[in-house]
Interface confidence: medium
């Protein structure tokens, strides 16, 4: 089965590692930038809409997450929204901003030890629990993950980075959304735009990691619009 | 232009094994996954597995765990699929993937 | 038998909709994984339609759409054309077999 894409906070939805950039740690780049789909033998790019509609907060953006425009209004129109910072009303883990979750109806800061055993334990999507996560690396038997609740190695596919181990997110990969390793100071990363350019990325990359922002590379400035390079750097 | 390009159909005897190639351009070969996908004559596509070509990494899928190996070479762009102790019925077009591009595919003929 | 179902064949007259559907269950379509489409023609690679459900590649008609409900996914095709005729397959991942999996493919024939 073949490889997949997306992209969200908790990063949403997706199988193990079929198509996309790997992200490896060690790279420069962890994964390809991905509003692109090669269709034919050309790269297209993927239609866009503005709002963008959709029906689970899988479909947008890592800072986004779906939900009715207006309080109380037709569940049946959902775009993608601006995700929550920190401090501000929740009331599921997508709804905040990378690296922050949501706790007692409010967007916290999500470090590390207490994040990790806590989200697990408290997401209730409507997936039910039953999904296991793949170790990404060789193996010739399969555990039953109940038994063997082990978070996912890179590579593993993931609905959630709540599967993940330390240091990973679940990203899109085109086939699935697979553990991918958070980026790290200098690593290229993924700017979304609120407007216009929206789409799924085929191959999403994580959200930088603690204490780093995605911010366009000084060296850059002067570049165009189009082609200026962000990279996760120190706040 | 990111292509994969396979190697040509194979012909082998029960009991032998086969080794398929898929030399890939035109992108990162070590920022992605290759899968492996069959498809026997007149059926459906089957996933087989698939390799992290930067560590080397697979997974298999539980059919072929005991038959098959994956591995690449990063120097090169390749990656490679080998089904060990061939029967008729892997008799397919084996095809190997990087989810959003698909190699043209290599038909393996297993017959005495 | 394949993990995700789909009808054997179906049929329809130029200009007309059919539909496609694909049955999975609760470790796979049912879990939250993503359903994808592919169109294959006779001798070729399979060809990406939809992903994620129902999105489409730039290049792909808009009279191709999917959609998703429970544990099925769906896709339609209107306006069906004679160069519609090919096999189409769904695919998903299952958490239970740790594998990517295919529906059985379904051959459309336009009359």
């Known amino acids: 089965t073949l490889n997949s894409v997306l992209n969200s906070n908790a990063i949403k939805n997706l199988p193990p590692p079929l198509g996309g950039a790997a992200g490896h740690p060690g790279s420069a780049v962890s994964a390809a930038p991905g509003i692109l789909y090669p269709g034919g033998n050309k790269y297209q790019t993927i239609d866009n809409y503005q709002p963008y509609p959709c029906a689970e907060d899988e479909e947008c953006g890592t800072d986004e997450y779906c939900a009715s425009p207006t309080r109380g209004g037709d569940a049946g129109v959902q775009i993608c929204l601006a995700c929550r910072k920190r401090r501000k009303r929740c009331m599921r883990h997508a709804m905040c901003c990378p690296g922050n979750y949501c706790k007692n109806g409010i967007c916290v800061s999500s470090d590390q030890n207490h994040f990790r055993g806590e989200i697990e334990e408290t997401i209730t999507e409507s997936f039910g629990n039953d999904h296991s996560t793949l170790d990404g690396y060789s193996r010739r038997t399969t555990l039953s993950s109940k038994m063997y609740h082990t978070k996912g190695q890179e590579g593993s596919v993931c609905l959630r980075s709540s599967d993940c181990a330390s240091g990973l997110c679940c990203a899109r990969h085109f086939w699935s959304k697979i553990c991918k390793p958070v980026l790290k100071e200098g690593q290229v990363c993924t700017k979304h735009r609120r407007k216009g350019s929206h789409g799924l990325e085929i191959f999403q990359r994580c959200y930088c990691g603690e204490g780093l922002s995605c911010r366009i590379q000084k060296d850059h400035h002067q570049a165009s619009n189009s082609s200026r390079l962000h990279t996760c750097q120190r706040h | 232009e990111v292509q994969l390009v396979q190697s040509g159909a194979e012909v082998k005897k029960p009991g032998a094994s086969v080794k398929v190639s898929c030399k890939a351009s035109g992108y990162t070969f070590t920022d992605y996954y290759i899968h492996w996908v069959r498809q026997a004559p007149g059926q459906g596509l089957e996933w087989m597995g698939w390799?992290?070509?930067?560590?080397?990494?697979?997974t298999y899928a539980q059919k072929f765990q005991a038959r098959v190996t994956m591995s690449r070479d990063t120097s090169s762009s390749t990656a490679y699929m080998e089904l060990s102790r061939l029967e008729s019925d892997d008799t397919a077009m084996y095809f190997c993937?990087?989810?959003?591009?698909w190699g043209q595919g290599t038909l393996v003929t297993v017959s005495s | 038998q394949s993990v995700l179902t789909q009808p054997p064949s179906v049929s329809g007259a130029p200009g007309q909709r059919v539909t496609i559907s694909c049955t999975g269950s609760s470790s796979n379509i049912g879990a939250g994984y993503d359903v994808h489409w592919y169109q294959q023609l006779p001798g070729t690679a399979p060809k990406l339609l939809i992903y994620?459900?129902?999105n489409r590649p730039s290049g792909v008609p808009d009279r191709f759409s999917g959609s998703k409900s429970g544990a099925s996914a769906s896709l339609a095709i209107t306006g069906l054309r004679p160069d519609d005729e090919a096999d189409y397959y769904c695919?998903?991942?299952?958490?239970?077999?740790?594998?990517?999996?295919f529906g059985g493919g379904t051959q459309l024939t336009v009359l």
């Open positions: 993937s990087r989810e959003d591009y």
């Open positions: 994620g459900y129902s």
């Open positions: 390799i992290h070509s930067n560590s080397g990494a697979t």
């Open positions: 695919q998903s991942y299952d958490n239970s077999l740790s594998s990517y999996v």
